[in-house]
C-alpha cells in the first residue's frame, strides 16, 4: 500500500513500459523540506523490488547517481516479463530503531509488441445470427493490448468492434453484431484485425469470405418420425429447418450400436423416408443441414430423437429339442424345450408360444399356448408323433418349427463313434466324434446335449444343446459350463425317423475330490467280500470322477496296502473283492480319482472274513 507520495516522487526513464531485455533508470526524489528532520545529510534513499507483492531485492548497490539527502537514481536490468513494483524508502541512519519510511513507488511493465493476428475465422450461426470472428493472437504480450476487428463489404459497408487482452482476460473473439442476409450470397467481405499496445502495433493479413463461407445453419429442430401403417422397418423422419437449407445429412443407429447409418438428402424439405429399419429396436436419429450443395458448412448435429420402431411378426425358426421318458406301461412324457428367438428374429415382445403335438397316423392333435420356453405332456407310447412350436408377438406368429419325436438313443447303428470331451479352458469343453459306422439312413444333423451330473428338476433345469450340421464332427460347448462340475454329454445322430446316441462325461476344470466315498457296509457272500459305499456328495467331487480305489491292509501292519481300482459308474455302489485271508482283521477304505488326482481317504472300516481263502 503506497501513500499518495507525500514525501517525494519516483520517475522512470525511458518509460514505465519497456521491451523485454531493456534497462530502466528509476529516480527517487524527496520533496522540499522532507527527509530526516535534524540531519538532512543523513537521508538515505533505498529502492526495493517486489514481484507479486513479495520483496525480492534491495537495489542499494545499483545506484548510478546520488544527490546526498535529496535524490538517488538506480539502474534496473534483467526484468522479467510482466509487472514489477519498485518502492523507494527513506532510511534515517541516525535512528536505527525506526524502520525506513515509504516515499513513493512505481510499476514497470515488461512486455513485447503484438504479433500480427493470424488464422482469422468468421461464422454466422443461422440466417438470423450475427457475424462473429475469432483469431490467433500469437505470443502473449504481457501488456494491455487492444484489438480492433474491422469488416468491410459491398455498398461501403464498414463495421468495427474492439476488445483488449491483459493479465485477467484474453481477447481473441468479437461479435460484430451485424447480420449478413442471403441476398448478399455472392458478395465478398474483408475482415482485418489490428493489435496495438505501448510497445507497438501490427495488423493481420486481410481475410476474405462470402456469405456461404461463414453462415452455419442452425441445427434442425422438432424432429419426429412417423411409421407408415405402424411398420417396424419403414418410417418418415420429419423436422424443421431454416428456409435456405438445400442439403441434409441424416444419421441413425440402434442405441447399442457403434457405427452410424449415414444418408444425404437433397431438397428434402424437412422429410425423408427410411426403409431399412429394424423392427422393435431403440434408435437414435440426428440431422445436420447445409445451405449450399458444394460450398458452406454443415450445421451442428440436431438434438437426438430416440424412439423404438414398432413390432413386426417374428421371423426365423425356433431351435427345438425334447426329452422323452416312459412313465408307465403305455404312456410317455414328452418335454419340449426351445431357445428364445434373438431380438432381430423376435421383432417384438414374444407374448406366447403356440405348441402342437400331433400323432401322424391317427391325426390326434394336442395344442396349447405357453409363455415358458418348455412344455410337457403325457401321450401314448404308441404311434408316430411330431411336435411344432411357433412364437407370437402382438403382430403375428413365426412359421412353426417341426420336429419328429423319435427314440433318441434307440438305434445302435446311428450311434456316433469315438466321442471325446476335452477341457479347453475354465468355461468350455470341446466335444469331438466320428460318424456312425453302419447307419442305414443318412444323418440329417447331430445334436450335442449336456446336463450337469448333479440332481436337478426336469422342468426347472432344461437341457442345453447345440445343433450341428451333418458334415461337422465337433462342437465347443460353453453355455452354462462351470468349472469343477462334471457334465454328461450326449452326441445324437438323427435321421428322418430314427436316432442314435453316444455318451461321455467331461468337465472344463477339475481338482482332486474333497473326500473319498463313505463305506457303509462290508458283507461276506460265497467267500467274497462285498464293499458297499455312498457316493461323494456332488459339490465335493470337483470334476468328473474317473474311478474309485478300494484299499485294504492287515490291521497293525506297516506294509503298503493293496488296492483294487473300479471304473466309476454312478449306478454302482458296491464291489466284490476276493483276495483277503479268513480270520485276519483288515482295515479298508476308499478314495476317488479325477484327472487332477486322488482324494483323501474316506472312512476306515475293519472287517474279519470268516470264509475260506481263495
Amino acid at each position: 500500500n503506497i501513500d499518495v507520495c507525500k514525501l517525494g516522487t519516483v520517475t522512470v526513464q525511458p518509460a514505465p513500459v519497456i521491451p523485454l531485455g531493456s534497462a530502466a533508470n528509476i529516480s527517487c526524489s524527496l520533496n522540499p523540506k522532507q527527509g530526516c528532520s535534524h540531519y538532512p545529510s543523513s537521508n538515505e534513499l533505498i529502492l526495493l523490488k517486489f514481484v507479486n507483492d513479495v520483496l525480492v531485492e534491495n537495489l542499494h548497490g545499483k545506484k548510478v547517481h546520488d544527490h546526498t539527502g535529496h535524490s538517488s537514481t538506480f539502474q534496473v536490468t534483467n526484468l522479467s516479463l510482466g509487472m514489477t513494483l519498485f518502492v523507494c524508502k527513506l532510511n534515517c541512519s541516525n535512528s536505527q530503531k525506526k524502520p525506513p519510511v515509504p516515499v513513493c513507488g512505481v510499476e514497470i511493465s515488461v512486455g513485447v509488441a503484438p504479433e500480427p493476428p493470424q488464422n482469422i475465422s468468421c461464422v454466422q450461426e443461422g440466417e438470423n445470427g450475427t457475424v462473429a470472428c475469432s483469431w490467433n493472437s500469437g505470443k502473449v504480450t504481457y501488456l494491455k493490448t487492444n484489438y480492433t476487428l474491422q469488416l468491410s463489404g459491398p455498398n461501403n459497408l464498414t463495421c468495427q468492434k474492439q476488445c483488449f487482452s491483459d493479465n485477467r482476460q484474453n481477447c481473441n473473439r468479437l461479435d460484430l453484431g451485424i447480420n449478413l442476409s442471403p441476398d448478399l450470397a455472392e458478395s465478398r467481405f474483408i475482415v482485418r484485425v489490428t493489435a496495438i499496445n505501448d510497445l507497438g502495433n501490427s495488423s493481420s493479413l486481410p481475410h476474405t469470405f462470402t456469405f456461404l463461407d461463414i453462415v452455419i445453419p442452425l441445427p434442425p429442430w422438432d424432429i419426429r418420425i412417423n411409421f407408415l401403417n405402424a411398420s417396424g422397418s419403414r418410417g418418415t423422419l420429419q423436422w424443421e429447418d431454416e428456409g435456405q437449407v438445400v442439403l441434409n445429412q441424416l444419421r441413425y443407429q440402434p442405441l447399442n450400436s457403434t457405427s452410424w447409418n449415414m444418408v444425404n438428402a437433397t431438397n428434402a424439405k424437412g422429410k425423408y423416408d427410411l426403409r431399412d429399419l429394424r423392427p422393435f429396436t431403440e434408435y437414435e436419429f440426428q440431422i445436420s443441414s447445409k445451405l449450399h450443395l458444394s460450398g458452406g458448412s454443415w450445421s451442428n448435429w440436431s438434438e437426438s430423437l430416440r424412439t423404438r420402431t414398432p413390432e413386426e411378426e417374428p421371423v426365423g425358426i425356433l431351435d427345438i429339442w425334447y426329452m422323452k421318458q416312459d412313465i408307465d406301461y403305455d404312456r410317455q412324457q414328452i418335454s419340449l424345450f426351445w431357445k428364445s428367438l434373438n431380438p432381430s428374429e423376435a421383432r417384438g415382445k414374444i407374448l406366447h408360444y403356440q405348441v402342437t403335438l400331433q400323432e401322424v397316423t391317427k391325426k390326434t392333435t394336442l395344442q396349447n399356448t405357453t409363455r415358458h420356453t418348455s412344455w410337457t405332456r403325457v401321450i401314448p407310447r404308441t404311434g408316430a408323433w411330431t411336435a411344432s412350436v411357433s412364437a407370437a408377438n402382438s403382430k403375428g406368429a413365426s412359421a412353426p418349427t417341426h420336429i419328429n419325436i423319435v427314440d433318441l438313443c434307440g438305434t445302435g447303428l446311428l450311434a456316433p463313434h469315438q466321442v471325446s470331451a476335452k477341457s479347453e479352458n475354465m468355461d468350455n469343453i470341446l466335444v469331438t466324434w466320428q460318424p456312425p459306422k453302419k447307419a442305414d439312413s443318412a444323418v440329417r444333423e447331430y445334436i450335442v446335449e449336456w446336463r450337469a451330473l448333479q440332481p436337478g428338476s426336469i422342468t426347472k433345469f432344461p437341457p442345453h444343446w447345440l445343433r450341428i450340421p451333418p458334415d461337422n464332427m465337433s462342437a465347443l460347448i460353453s453355455e452354462n459350463i462351470k468349472p469343477y462340475i462334471c457334465y454328461e454329454i450326449r452326441v445324437h445322430a438323427l435321421s428322418e425317423s430314427q436316432g442314435g446316441c453316444s455318451s461321455i462325461r467331461g468337465d472344463s476344470k477339475h481338482k482332486a475330490p474333497v473326500s473319498g466315498p463313505h463305506i457303509t457296509a462290508i458283507t461276506e457272500k460265497k467267500e467274497r467280500l462285498f464293499i458297499s459305499w455312498t457316493h461323494i456328495p456332488f459339490p465335493e467331487q470337483r470334476g468328473c470322477i474317473l474311478h474309485y480305489r478300494i484299499y485294504w491292509k492287515e490291521r497293525d501292519s506297516t506294509a503298503q496296502p493293496e488296492l483294487c481300482e473300479i471304473q466309476y459308474r454312478r449306478s454302482q455302489n458296491s464291489h466284490p473283492i476276493s483276495s483277503l485271508q479268513p480270520r485276519v482283521t483288515y482295515v479298508l477304505w476308499m478314495t476317488a480319482v479325477t484327472a487332477a488326482g486322488e482324494s483323501p481317504q474316506g472312512n476306515e472300516r475293519e472287517f474279519c472274513p470268516q470264509g475260506k481263502a481263495n
Epitope: Q325, T370, H372, S374, W375, T376, R451, A452, L453, Q454, P455, G456, S457, I458, T459, K460, F461, Y487, E488, R490, S503, R505, R570, S571
Partner: nanobody, 119 residues
C-alpha cells in the same frame, strides 16, 4: 435321499370326493416334478397326474376334469383332489418324485394309500 409319505385315502361311495396328500422330506432341493400313480388289483401301475415346477399339470384322460393336482411349496406337499369318484378309481395311489442327474432319472416312491370306491 428323498422320502415321500401319502395320506388321505379311504373308502367312499361313488360320486364322493377325497383329497390325497403327499409330503416330501430329505434331499428335496431338486425335486420339482411330482406325480400321482395308481395300481388297481391285478393291473399294472398307471400314471394319474403330474405337476411341474412351473405349476403346469397334466392328467390321465379318464380322470381329466374330475381330479386336480396342486402343490404347496412351503409345506413340500402335493395334493390330489378327487371329485366324482367312480368304482374304477379304486386302487392304491402312490406319490412319485422324479429328478434328473445327467440323463438318468431317479425316482422316489411313497408307500401308497388305499382308495376304495363302492357303487
Amino acid at each position: 435321499q428323498v422320502q415321500l409319505q401319502e395320506s388321505g385315502g379311504g373308502s367312499v361311495q361313488a360320486g364322493d370326493s377325497l383329497r390325497l396328500s403327499c409330503t416330501a422330506s430329505g434331499s428335496i432341493f431338486a425335486i420339482d416334478d411330482m406325480y400321482w400313480y395308481r395300481q388297481a388289483p391285478g393291473k399294472q401301475r398307471e400314471f394319474v397326474a403330474y405337476i411341474t415346477a412351473t405349476n403346469s399339470a397334466n392328467y390321465l384322460d379318464s380322470v381329466n376334469g374330475r381330479f386336480t393336482i396342486s402343490r404347496d411349496n412351503a409345506k413340500n406337499s402335493v395334493y390330489l383332489q378327487m371329485n366324482s369318484l367312480k368304482p374304477e378309481d379304486t386302487a392304491v395311489y402312490y406319490c412319485n418324485a422324479k429328478q434328473i442327474v445327467g440323463f438318468q432319472i431317479d425316482e422316489y416312491w411313497g408307500q401308497g394309500t388305499q382308495v376304495t370306491v363302492s357303487s
